[in-house]
Interface confidence: low
């Protein structure tokens, strides 16, 4: 025998208290598939969460984060505090990137400067807390007169010219 509830479309639920009649989902609830025996409660984007998409009878609300925070996790399950460029979020709050690392975004971790010498290249522009180094052409690529760029002396640490 076919399950009578299978005829209930998305946006309704199979109401067992009413002889398995398909009843519309109550306010603030939804069913995204047919044949459901209950409607799911809509997600509420409260506090540091902000509504990106309102809940409908067939789809859940979608949240993002208020300014100063960014989403983490599937479906923006958490909001994490933004930091400034040149910083990363630690358990003690926003901290400046350590020397030799950078972060050009308001989220995420500080990443090491590119080691230009690994590719046989020179450092064209030194790195900062906010920006990676810019690698120049390798000295071998610079035949006399081929470029007006004079590469700086090779750095002892990636991205940092000798003092």
């Amino acid at each position: 025998l076919q399950d009578p509830c299978s005829n209930c479309p998305a946006g309704t639920f199979c109401d067992n208290n009413r002889n398995q009649i398909c009843s519309p989902c109550p306010p603030n609830s939804f069913s995204s598939a047919g044949g459901q025996r209950t409607c799911d409660i809509c997600r509420q984007c409260k506090g540091v969460f902000r509504t990106r998409k309102e809940c409908s009878s067939t789809s859940n609300a979608e949240c993002d984060c208020t300014p100063g925070f960014h989403c983490l996790g599937a479906g923006c399950s958490m909001c994490e505090q933004d930091c400034k460029q040149g910083q990363e979020l630690t358990k003690k709050g926003c901290k400046d990137c350590c020397f030799g690392t950078f972060n050009d975004q308001k989220r995420g971790r500080c990443r090491p400067w590119t080691n230009c010498s690994l590719d046989g290249k020179s450092v064209l522009v030194n790195g900062t807390k906010e920006r990676d180094v810019v690698c120049g052409p390798s000295p071998a690529d610079l035949s006399p007169g081929a470029s007006s760029v004079t590469p700086p002396a090779p750095a002892r640490e990636p991205g940092h010219s000798p003092q």
């Epitope: 540091v48 958490m78 994490e80 505090q81």
Partner: antibody
Framework: QVQLQESGPGLVKPSETLSITCTVS????????VHWVRQPPGKGLEGLGV???????NYNSALMSRLTISKDNSKSQVSLKMSSLTAADTAMYYC???????????WGQGTTVTVSS | DIQMTQSPSSLSASLGDRVTISCSAS??????LNWYQQKPDGTVKLLIY???TLHSGVPSRFSGSGSGTDFTLTISSLQPEDVATYYC?????????FGGGTKLEIK
């Protein structure tokens, strides 16, 4: 170093309104939320409500009609007001900083409130 | 509201013992659970967040585990300074709610 310090009246009469202030130092109220928690004598912790960096609030549903949480960013102060007090509101009241990743990482020392005539 | 139930409500253990405290949620809360320690003088400190992440400065003898509705706080080797009441707290849904607490004493 981040510190939170609660200050309250100590003794309040039944039916009156309680007003407690949480002063935050070493942290900006525009970057973190503040949650109020209370603990009746000999009992567990009960969350009262939170005020977010942008100023929006969420309250314990059972106490919502009696609670107001507000803040003054320039003074780094958060205030809790609770109306229609009864003896059941006698408790230690704490404020705690809420990080964007949803935990209370710094707590105040608490302020004792006794509701009695 | 989501109800959080802790067990036992109190326990007594010897120094060096392995201690476990349980916390149960009335509905699934994924891993959205924190643990706090309240010392006898009333001071409250965060121990563990997001079920198992140790807060900075918390000794490594503390650990947390679980998912869904059942969670555990473990102290691998009980120390005198661990005498306190321990609370779990869910942040899956507002209002955030605490367990009833587990009072830990030394035998």
């Amino acid at each position: 170093q981040v510190q939170l310090q609660e200050s309250g009246p100590g003794l309040v009469k039944p039916s009156e309104t309680l007003s407690i202030t949480c002063t935050v130092s070493g942290s900006s109220l525009t970057s973190y939320g503040v949650h109020w928690v209370r603990q009746p004598p000999g009992k567990g912790l009960e969350g009262l409500g939170v005020i977010w960096p942008g100023g929006s609030t969420n309250y314990n549903s059972a106490l919502m009609s009696r609670l107001t949480i507000s803040k003054d960013n320039s003074k780094s102060q958060v205030s809790l007001k609770m109306s229609s007090l009864t003896a059941a509101d006698t408790a230690m009241y704490y404020c705690a900083r809420v990080t964007g990743t949803w935990y209370f990482d710094v707590w105040g020392q608490g302020t004792t409130v006794t509701v009695s005539s | 509201d989501i109800q959080m139930t802790q067990s036992p409500s109190s326990l007594s253990a010897s120094l060096g013992d392995r201690v476990t405290i349980s916390c149960s949620a009335s509905q699934g809360i994924s891993n959205y659970l924190n643990w706090y320690q309240q010392k006898p003088d009333g001071t409250v400190k965060l121990l563990i967040y997001y079920t198992s992440t140790l807060h900075s400065g918390v000794p490594s003898r503390f650990s947390g585990s679980g998912s869904g509705t059942d969670f555990t706080l473990t102290i691998s080797s009980l120390q005198p300074e661990d005498v306190a009441t321990y609370y779990c707290q869910q942040y899956s849904k507002l209002p955030w709610t605490f367990g009833g607490g587990t009072k830990l004493e030394i035998k």
